[in-house]
C-alpha cells in the first residue's frame, strides 16, 4: 500500500485527559466487575469432566483455534486490500483481526445453546496462544504497510490479565457447581441481575466517555469493514467447523468464538503502537467493531431462536431422532445450562 493522506477528519480533537477521567476509571472498574460475574455464572454451567474431554480430544478446540488465528487475521488483511484502505486504517483493522477471542462469545454461545465447555476452553486457549500468535501474526501481516516493530507492542500483561479474569471466576463457578449445587441457582440469578445493571451502567458511561468521538471513526469504508469482519468470522467459523464434521452445538460455538474479538486488547495495542496524531479517531475503531459484533451476534441469536421456535413438527421429530443417535440434545437444554453429549465429533446439524 502506498503512502496516503491520513484519514482522520479535520475536526476531530481528542477530549483532554481522555482515558484518565473519573468516568473512565468507573467504566474500567464496572467492566471488570461485570466480567467477573459473567464468568462466574458461565462457570456454573460447566463441568471439569467435559473440559477434560475437550482437552484430551481437542478436535473442536483445534478447529476453533485455526478459525481464530487463521480466518480473522486473513479476513482483516484481505478487507484492507479489497477496500484499499490507508495504511493506518489497515493496521488498525489488522490489530483487531489478530486479537484473541473475546468474552462476549461466551455469552453468545450460551444464548445459541452452544457448548459452554468448548466456549470457555477456546477463549482461554486463544488468549493463551495470543502470547505467541499475536506478535507472529502482526509481524507477518503488517510487513509492507508498517516499518515499526508492531510485534513489540503486544500487551503481554493485558493478555495475562484477560486469562486471569476468565479462569478465576470460571473455576469458582465450576467448583461451586460440583461442591455446592444448591447455591448455583442463586448465583446465576444474582449474577444475571448484576450483569443487567452493569450493562446499563456500561452503556451510559461509554456514551458519556466516548460521546461524539466515535462518529469520527464512522467513515463509510470503516463501517463496511467493521460490519463485514465479525460477519465473515461468524460465517467462516461455522463453515470450517461444518467441513470438519463438528456437531451443531460445537459449530455454533466455534462460529461465535471466531467472530468475537477481544476489543480491549485491540484498543491497548492501538493506544501504545501509534502516535495519537496518526491514529486519531481510528482509536475508536475497536469500539465500532464491538458495536457490530454485538449487533450481528444478537441478530444471529434472534434468528436461531426463531428457527428453534418455528421448526415444523417433522423437523422436531428428526431432531429428537438425531439427538438420540448422536447424543446431542439441542432443544433439551439441562436446567443448569449444560447439554448432554459434549463430544464435538458427530457430524450432525
Amino acid at each position: 500500500m502506498e503512502a496516503h493522506n491520513a484519514s482522520a477528519p479535520f475536526n476531530f480533537t481528542l477530549p483532554p485527559n481522555f482515558g484518565k477521567r473519573p468516568t473512565d476509571l468507573a467504566l474500567s472498574v464496572i467492566l471488570v466487575f461485570m466480567l467477573f460475574f459473567i464468568m462466574l455464572s458461565l462457570g456454573c454451567t460447566m463441568e471439569f469432566s467435559k473440559i477434560k474431554a475437550h482437552l484430551w480430544k481437542p478436535k473442536g478446540l483445534a478447529i476453533a483455534l485455526v478459525a481464530q488465528y487463521g480466518i480473522m487475521p486473513l479476513t482483516a488483511f484481505v478487507l484492507g486490500k479489497v477496500f484499499r484502505l490507508k495504511n493506518i486504517e489497515a493496521l488498525a483493522i489488522l490489530v483487531c483481526g489478530c486479537s484473541p477471542g473475546g468474552n462476549l462469545s461466551n455469552v453468545f454461545s450460551l444464548a445459541m445453546k452452544g457448548d459452554m465447555n468448548l466456549s470457555i476452553v477456546m477463549t482461554t486457549c486463544s488468549t493463551f496462544c495470543a502470547l505467541g500468535m499475536m506478535p507472529l501474526l502482526l509481524y507477518i501481516y503488517s510487513r509492507g504497510i508498517y516499518d515499526g516493530d508492531l510485534k513489540d507492542k503486544v500487551p503481554y500483561k493485558g493478555i495475562v490479565i484477560s486469562l486471569v479474569l476468565v479462569l478465576i471466576p470460571c473455576t469458582i463457578g465450576i467448583v461451586l457447581k460440583s461442591k455446592r449445587p444448591q447455591y448455583m441457582r442463586y448465583v446465576i440469578k444474582g449474577g444475571m441481575i448484576i450483569i443487567l445493571l452493569c450493562s446499563v451502567a456500561v452503556t451510559v458511561l461509554s456514551a458519556i466517555n466516548v460521546g461524539k468521538s466515535i462518529m469520527f471513526a464512522m467513515t463509510p469504508l470503516l463501517i463496511a469493514t467493521s460490519s463485514l469482519m465479525p460477519f465473515i468470522g461468524f460465517l467462516l467459523g461455522y463453515v470450517l467447523s461444518a467441513l470438519f464434521c463438528l456437531n451443531g452445538r460445537c459449530r455454533r460455538t466455534v462460529s461465535m468464538e471466531t467472530g468475537c474479538q477481544n476489543v480491549q486488547l485491540c484498543s491497548t495495542i492501538l493506544n501504545v503502537a501509534f502516535p495519537p496524531e496518526v491514529i486519531g479517531p481510528l482509536f475508536f475503531f475497536p469500539l465500532l467493531y464491538m458495536i457490530f459484533q454485538l449487533g450481528e451476534g444478537l441478530l444471529l441469536i434472534a434468528i436461531f431462536w426463531c428457527y428453534e421456535k418455528f421448526k415444523t413438527p417433522k423437523d422436531k421429530t428428526k431432531m429428537i431422532y438425531t439427538a438420540a443417535t448422536t447424543e446431542e440434545t439441542i432443544p433439551g437444554a439441562l436446567g443448569n445450562g449444560t447439554y448432554k453429549g459434549e463430544d464435538c465429533s458427530p457430524c450432525t446439524a
Epitope: 479535520f10 480533537t13 481528542l14 493506544n271 501504545v272 502516535p275 496518526v278
Partner: antibody, heavy 126, light 108 residues
Framework: QVQLQQSGAELVKPGASVKLSCKAS????????IHWIKQMSGQGLEWIGW????????KYSEKFKDKATLTADKSSSTVYMELNRLTSEDSAVYFC???????????????????WGQGTTLTVSS | EIVLTQSPAIMSASPGEKVTITCRAS???????LHWYQQKSGVSPKLWIY???NLASGVPARFSGSGSGTSYSLTINSVEAEDAATYYC?????????FGGGTTLEIK
C-alpha cells in the same frame, strides 16, 4: 542527542520545484511524526503537514495540500518536502520538527513539537 | 480553524521587570493543547512551556504560564537580558496545529 539536520539554503526560479530534506538521528525514526512548518520573513509560523515514517501516512494542511509533497527514505532516516510551482510567496524559512510522543499512549498526547531542525531558507527569485 | 492572536506584537522591558504576554484564541482551546515556544533571531524555535503551565527542560523558573478557554498568558517574573526573543503560542485542535503571530520582547 536528538537531531534534525536540514539541507542548505536554496535559490530557485519561479515556476520551478524544490526538494528540501530533513535527516533524523538519535531516535527511532519510525516511531514519530515529522512535521514541516513555514516561516516567512519577519512573520509567524505556519503548519504545513506531517509524515509518519512508520506507516507512510501523511497529513497536509488544507492550504498546502496542492503545494507540498512529503516523502521519506527510511534507510537514511530522511524526510523530504517537495514544493512545486514556486512563487515569491513561497520564499521563507522551512523548519522540520519532531512531534512529541508519550509512549504511555494515546491518552497522553499533548500535541507539541519537542525538537526542531535548524531551518532551510528558500528564496524564489528570477 | 482556531486563530491565535498574541498581544502585544512588540514590547520592551527593563531587566528585573515583570512581563506578561497574552494569547487569545478565536474559540476555546484545551489547556492541555496550548504551548509556548521561544525563538531567538536566526535560530529555530524552542519548546518553552507545554500544556499551558509546564516548563520545558532547561527553562528558568522565572517563566510561568497560565490560562484556560480562550485566554492564555506567559509571564516572566523578573526579566533578564537573555530573555530577548520572539515568543509564539501554539495550539492543537481538529487535526490542525496553529501558531500565534508572535510577541517580540526587547530588553532596554
Amino acid at each position: 542527542q536528538v537531531q534534525l539536520q536540514q539541507s542548505g539554503a536554496e535559490l530557485v526560479k519561479p515556476g520551478a520545484s524544490v526538494k528540501l530534506s530533513c535527516k533524523a538521528s538519535d531516535f527511532t525514526f519510525t516511531e514519530y511524526t515529522i512535521h514541516w512548518i513555514k516561516q516567512m520573513s519577519g512573520q509567524g509560523l505556519e503548519w504545513i503537514g506531517w509524515f509518519y515514517p512508520g506507516s507512510g501516512d501523511i497529513k497536509y494542511s488544507e492550504k498546502f495540500k496542492d503545494k507540498a509533497t512529503l516523502t521519506a527514505d527510511k534507510s537514511s532516516s530522511t524526510v523530504y518536502m517537495e514544493l512545486n510551482r514556486l512563487t515569491s510567496e513561497d520564499s521563507a524559512v522551512y523548519f522540520c520538527a519532531r512531534h512529541m510522543r508519550d509512549f504511555r499512549g494515546f491518552y497522553y498526547g499533548r500535541f507539541y513539537f519537542d525538537y526542531w531542525g535548524q531551518g532551510t531558507t528558500l528564496t524564489v527569485s528570477s | 480553524e482556531i486563530v491565535l492572536t498574541q498581544s502585544p506584537a512588540i514590547m520592551s522591558a527593563s531587566p528585573g521587570e515583570k512581563v506578561t504576554i497574552t494569547c487569545r484564541a478565536s474559540s476555546s482551546v484545551s489547556s492541555s493543547y496550548l504551548h509556548w515556544y521561544q525563538q531567538k533571531s536566526g535560530v529555530s524555535p524552542k519548546l518553552w512551556i507545554y500544556s499551558t503551565s509546564n516548563l520545558a527542560s532547561g527553562v528558568p523558573a522565572r517563566f510561568s504560564g497560565s490560562g484556560s478557554g480562550t485566554s492564555y498568558s506567559l509571564t516572566i517574573n523578573s526579566v533578564e537580558a537573555e530573555d530577548a526573543a520572539t515568543y509564539y503560542c501554539q495550539q492543537y485542535s481538529g487535526y490542525r496545529w496553529t501558531f500565534g503571530g508572535g510577541t517580540t520582547l526587547e530588553i532596554k
